[in-house]
C-alpha cells in the first residue's frame, strides 16, 4: 500500500520471493527527487529491532543495522535519484522471510509501504528422454526446491489425462539439508507428442516441455513466481 496526500509521497512495493543461497531483491519505488542528499531510505523488518538498511545523504548508514543483515544489503545507489529504493539482499536465507517496510523521506514529503517477502527454493526443470528404461520414458529433473513441491505431468495429445499411475516422483535432500532435488519419471510415452512436467509450490511454478518426434527432440522450460506484484 502507499500513502499519498499533502506532505506525503507515494511509495510502491512489490511482493517478491527470494531463492535461498542466491541474491534477492526487495522492490520499492517512490516519487523521484533530484536532491540526492535530501533522500532518506529506511528498510525495516517486522519483529527485528534495528534497521535492515539505511541510505541517507547520498550514502549507506549502517550504524543502526541489525547484525543479521550486516554485509548482506545494498541499495542501487545510482538509481535512488530516479526513485528506486529497492534493496539487494545477499545469500537469501529462509529466516529472511517476513514483512518489510520501505520508508522514504525526501524534500517533497514522506511515505512508506509494506511488502511480504517469501523465501524458498525454485529452479528450472530439465526433461530428457530416458533410454535406459525398459520402455520409452521421460525424466524430469529440477535441482533445488523448497518447500516440497507437487509434480504433475500433462500431454498435448491426451489432454486431461491423469498420469499419476504411470509416473514416479522422488525428492532427494540436497547437501545443505534444506532444499531438495526433484526427479519425476514418466513411463510409456509415445512419440509425436508434447509432454509437460509441472513443478509447483507456494512460491513458484515451473514447467518443462518436451516434444519427441522421430527426427528430433525439442525442449522448453519456464519459471514464474507466484503472487508477485504490487
Amino acid at each position: 500500500f502507499g500513502i499519498s496526500g499533502k506532505h506525503f509521497i507515494t511509495v510502491t512495493t512489490f511482493t517478491s520471493a527470494g531463492n535461498i543461497g542466491e541474491d534477492g531483491t526487495l522492490s520499492c519505488t517512490f516519487e523521484p527527487d533530484i536532491k540526492l542528499n535530501g533522500i532518506v531510505i529506511q528498510w525495516l523488518k517486522e519483529g527485528i529491532k534495528g534497521l535492515v538498511h539505511e541510505f541517507k545523504e547520498g550514502k549507506d548508514d549502517l550504524s543502526q543495522q541489525h547484525e543479521m543483515f550486516r554485509g548482506r544489503t545494498a541499495v542501487f545507489a545510482d538509481q535512488v535519484v530516479v526513485g528506486n529504493a529497492s534493496l539487494r539482499l545477499k545469500n537469501v536465507q529462509l529466516t529472511d522471510a517476513g514483512t518489510y517496510t520501505c520508508y522514504i523521506r525526501t524534500s517533497k514529503g514522506k511515505g512508506n509501504a509494506n511488502l511480504e517477502y517469501k523465501t524458498g527454493a525454485f529452479s528450472m526443470p530439465e526433461i530428457n528422454v530416458d533410454y535406459n528404461a525398459s520402455s520409452e520414458s521421460l525424466r524430469c529433473e529440477a535441482p533445488r526446491w523448497f518447500p516440497q513441491p507437487t509434480v504433475a505431468w500433462a500431454s498435448q495429445v491426451d489432454q486431461g489425462a491423469n498420469f499419476s499411475e504411470v509416473s514416479n516422483t522422488s525428492f532427494e535432500l540436497n547437501s545443505e539439508n534444506v532444499t531438495m532435488k526433484v526427479v519425476s519419471v514418466l513411463y510409456n510415452v509415445t512419440i509425436n507428442n508434447t509432454y509437460s512436467c509441472m513443478i509447483e509450490n507456494d512460491i513458484a511454478k515451473a514447467t518443462g516441455d518436451i516434444k519427441v518426434t522421430d527426427s528430433e527432440v525439442k525442449r522448453r522450460s519456464q519459471l514464474q513466481l507466484l503472487n508477485s506484484g504490487p
Epitope: 543461497g21 550514502k59 549502517l62 550504524s63 544489503t73 545507489a77 539487494r88 545477499k90 545443505e176
Partner: antibody, heavy 121, light 107 residues
Framework: EVQLVQSGAEVKKPGASVKVSCKAS????????IGWVRQAPGQGLEWIGD????????NYNEKFKGRATLTRDTSTSTAYLELSSLRSEDTAVYYC??????????????WGQGTLVTVSS | DIQMTQSPSSLSASVGDRVTITCKAS??????VAWYQQKPGKAPKLLIY???TLQPGVPSRFSGSGSGRDYTLTISSLQPEDFATYYC?????????FGQGTKVEIK
C-alpha cells in the same frame, strides 16, 4: 579509477607487531568493505578478515582472531592491518582489497600492490 | 567454516587447449564463488564472480559454472597469457575462504 596503495616492506623480529596501511582513492572509502589477504612464499591465498570503513564493523578468520586487528581512518581514507606476536610463519605478502557491492560484502575486485612482511630473528 | 577444495593442484596444457579447474565446497549451497588469476609477483585479478558472471574486461574464453557444492572455471582455448595460478573464493558466508590454487603450466 579505484586505487589501493599499500605501505612498504617490513622486517620484524619474532614476537613483535607490524602495522600495514592501505590508502584508498577513486571511490567513496566509507561505502565499501576492505578485505585483507596474505600469501606466504610459494603458498596460496589466505583470507585474514575485512572491515567496513563506514562503521568500523569487522569479520575475522578464526585463525587470526586475537592476533589481527583491522582499523581505519576515514579522514585519510586509509585501512590498517596490525598483526601482533609475529612468528616466522607470518612471513608473507599482505594484500588489501576492496570488496565489490558497497555495503554488500562481495568478491574482492580491486587489489593493492602487496606489502612483504618478513619475520626473522 | 566452509572449506574450498580445489583440483587439480597443477596441470600442464598447450596453447589452444580447453582447461577445466574445479572447486568443491565442504558444505551448503550458495552461488557466491569467484575465480582469480594470479601471475608471479602480482596481485590476484578477479575473473568471475557469483559463479558465472564475467568481470568487465575479462576475455570471454573464461567461463564459470556450478551449483550445489561443485564449481568450475573453464578456459575454452588457452592463450599464452593464461599460464598462471588460479584460485576460487567462497564469499557467501561470514567467513571467506580460498581454494588451494591450481597452477597452469606450459606442456
Amino acid at each position: 579509477e579505484v586505487q589501493l596503495v599499500q605501505s612498504g616492506a617490513e622486517v620484524k623480529k619474532p614476537g613483535a607487531s607490524v602495522k600495514v596501511s592501505c590508502k584508498a582513492s577513486g571511490y567513496t572509502f566509507t561505502s565499501y568493505w576492505i578485505g585483507w589477504v596474505r600469501q606466504a612464499p610459494g603458498q596460496g591465498l589466505e583470507w585474514i578478515g575485512d572491515i567496513y570503513p563506514g562503521g568500523g564493523y569487522t569479520n575475522y578468520n578464526e585463525k587470526f582472531k586475537g592476533r589481527a586487528t583491522l582499523t581505519r581512518d576515514t579522514s585519510t581514507s586509509t585501512a590498517y592491518l596490525e598483526l601482533s606476536s609475529l612468528r616466522s610463519e607470518d612471513t608473507a605478502v599482505y594484500y588489501c582489497a576492496r570488496l565489490d557491492g558497497s555495503s554488500y560484502r562481495g568478491a574482492m575486485d580491486s587489489w593493492g600492490q602487496g606489502t612483504l612482511v618478513t619475520v626473522s630473528s | 567454516d566452509i572449506q574450498m577444495t580445489q583440483s587439480p593442484s597443477s596441470l600442464s596444457a598447450s596453447v589452444g587447449d580447453r582447461v577445466t579447474i574445479t572447486c568443491k565446497a565442504s558444505q551448503g549451497f550458495n552461488k557466491y564463488v569467484a575465480w582469480y588469476q594470479q601471475k608471479p609477483g602480482k596481485a590476484p585479478k578477479l575473473l568471475i564472480y557469483y559463479t558465472s558472471t564475467l568481470q568487465p574486461g575479462v576475455p570471454s574464453r573464461f567461463s564459470g559454472s556450478g551449483s550445489g557444492r561443485d564449481y568450475t572455471l573453464t578456459i575454452s582455448s588457452l592463450q599464452p597469457e593464461d599460464f598462471a595460478t588460479y584460485y576460487c573464493l567462497q564469499y557467501g558466508n561470514l567467513l571467506y575462504a580460498f581454494g588451494q590454487g591450481t597452477k597452469v603450466e606450459i606442456k
